[in-house]
Amino acid sequence: EAIQVTQPSVVLASSHGVASFPCEYSPSHNTDEVRVTVLRQTNDQMTEVCATTFTEKNTVGFLDYPFCSGTFNESRVNLTIQGLRAVDTGLYLCKVELMYPPPYFVGMGNGTQIYVIDPEPCPDSD
Amino acid sequence: EAIQVTQPSVVLASSHGVASFPCEYSPSHNTDEVRVTVLRQTNDQMTEVCATTFTEKNTVGFLDYPFCSGTFNESRVNLTIQGLRAVDTGLYLCKVELMYPPPYFVGMGNGTQIYVIDPEPCPDSD
């Protein structure tokens, strides 16, 4: 890959179904606009979970996605996925594209295995 | 002498703090007494979690251990560890010793990473 993307190998979602993990890339180059895509790998298929483009001014991303949020600082993106349930357990890959200025660089992390356990329902209060 | 012990690489504890996984060994030989030990690896240190000896008649083990239970069938042990909390997340290894009749065989699995998420407390009922 043109750039190296690192992300943790395993993350546990909280009992509220929230998983947070960093996605870092190097070398960072001199980049004004960076596109970050979160993909889920199931078998041999990749599906896009969410994507956003960060700029120097726009360091909070994924505003169009209710389940994703992220902040950008230099060459590190802190990603949060919420609303996760046990069926969402799987491998989540972080893809980074250095969009502007040219040249175009792209890199993909090895993936973060997110484990999600559904909470037991609380007993009804009488 | 060595035997091959297999166990799953990852298991999620339920929201009640219960984790179950199989521990299988091969070749099975013709064995009357099999000792199974569950060890937890933290850093370079191994600590014994629980241990039991299965026989043809005694196929339910770990009676002296409140947090472990297990059943034995041919060359497979189904292990259950309960009372787990997030701090117990770690690598749990299954050790199998073919105790009787001779010759003595021993084998150790590569470990099962057990992930435990503490549940959120339920709101107090008024």
């Epitope: 606009e33 700029t55 502007y100 040249p103 | -």
Partner: antibody, heavy 114, light 113 residues
């Protein structure tokens, strides 16, 4: 399906200006840099310039500096090319392409002639 | 300015032939360890189609008979077994950082013998 559709081509007088549009669909337009490239009849490809995803940055080939402006309206998923002081040698098919040149429009022909 | 020179400018070949097109840059197009040189196919009246990026990576959906190689200043596009749909014009394209600019080779027309 990713689609880029150029429009605005036609006959232009020498010395005049042109404003071409490139309508995008099938992808998050605001997430990608876009290029303009042209091709004179029977000739090769010529890069004009690129605009950043946000529209905050542009870079142009030296040949076009001062004569070209690339802009975009992310709310309309549309890219624009403004080319001034047109001469006969600007006659070409003008293409928009999504960075990094994986997707291209079908092109629009501009003819500069009196 | 970096110039890109393709050779040959045209060639005639038959279906099943192995075809090689070269592209030479007037100075290195390597940048951060990557060769920023791409290859495109263009058919009459159609937009160019990306075949190979970063000198040797096949673009999505491109058949394995297309391959690219090279680094620095000398690059090659190879079609291992020419198919009827491969008769077209092929362009190499480079990115240079100073000044930041993309330039194309003059093209190689592959015709039916």
């Amino acid at each position: 399906e990713v689609q880029l559709v150029e429009s605005g081509g036609g006959l232009v007088q020498p010395g005049g200006s042109l404003r071409l549009s490139c309508a995008a669909s099938g992808f998050t337009f605001s997430g990608y840099a876009i290029h303009w490239v042209r091709q004179a009849p029977g000739k090769g490809l010529e890069w004009i310039g690129i605009i950043s995803p946000s529209g905050g940055g542009t870079k142009y080939a030296q040949k076009f500096q001062g004569r070209v402006t690339i802009s975009r309206d992310n709310s309309k998923n549309t890219l624009y090319l403004q080319l001034n002081s047109l001469r006969a040698e600007d006659t070409a098919v003008y293409y928009c392409a999504r960075h990094p040149f994986a997707y291209w429009g079908q092109g629009t022909l501009v003819t500069v002639s009196s | 300015d970096i110039q890109l020179t393709q050779s040959p400018s045209s060639l005639s070949a038959s279906v099943g032939d192995r075809v090689t097109i070269t592209c030479r840059a007037s100075q290195s197009v390597d940048f951060y360890g990557i060769s920023f040189l791409d290859w495109y196919q263009q058919k009459p009246g159609k937009a160019p189609k990306l075949l190979i990026y970063d000198a040797s990576n096949r673009a999505t959906g491109i058949p394995s008979r297309f391959s690219g190689s090279g680094s620095g200043t000398d690059f090659t596009l190879t079609i291992s077994s020419l198919q009827p749909e491969d008769f077209a014009t092929y362009y190499c394209q480079q990115y240079v950082s100073s000044p930041p600019e993309y330039t194309f080779g003059q093209g190689t027309k592959v015709e039916i013998k």
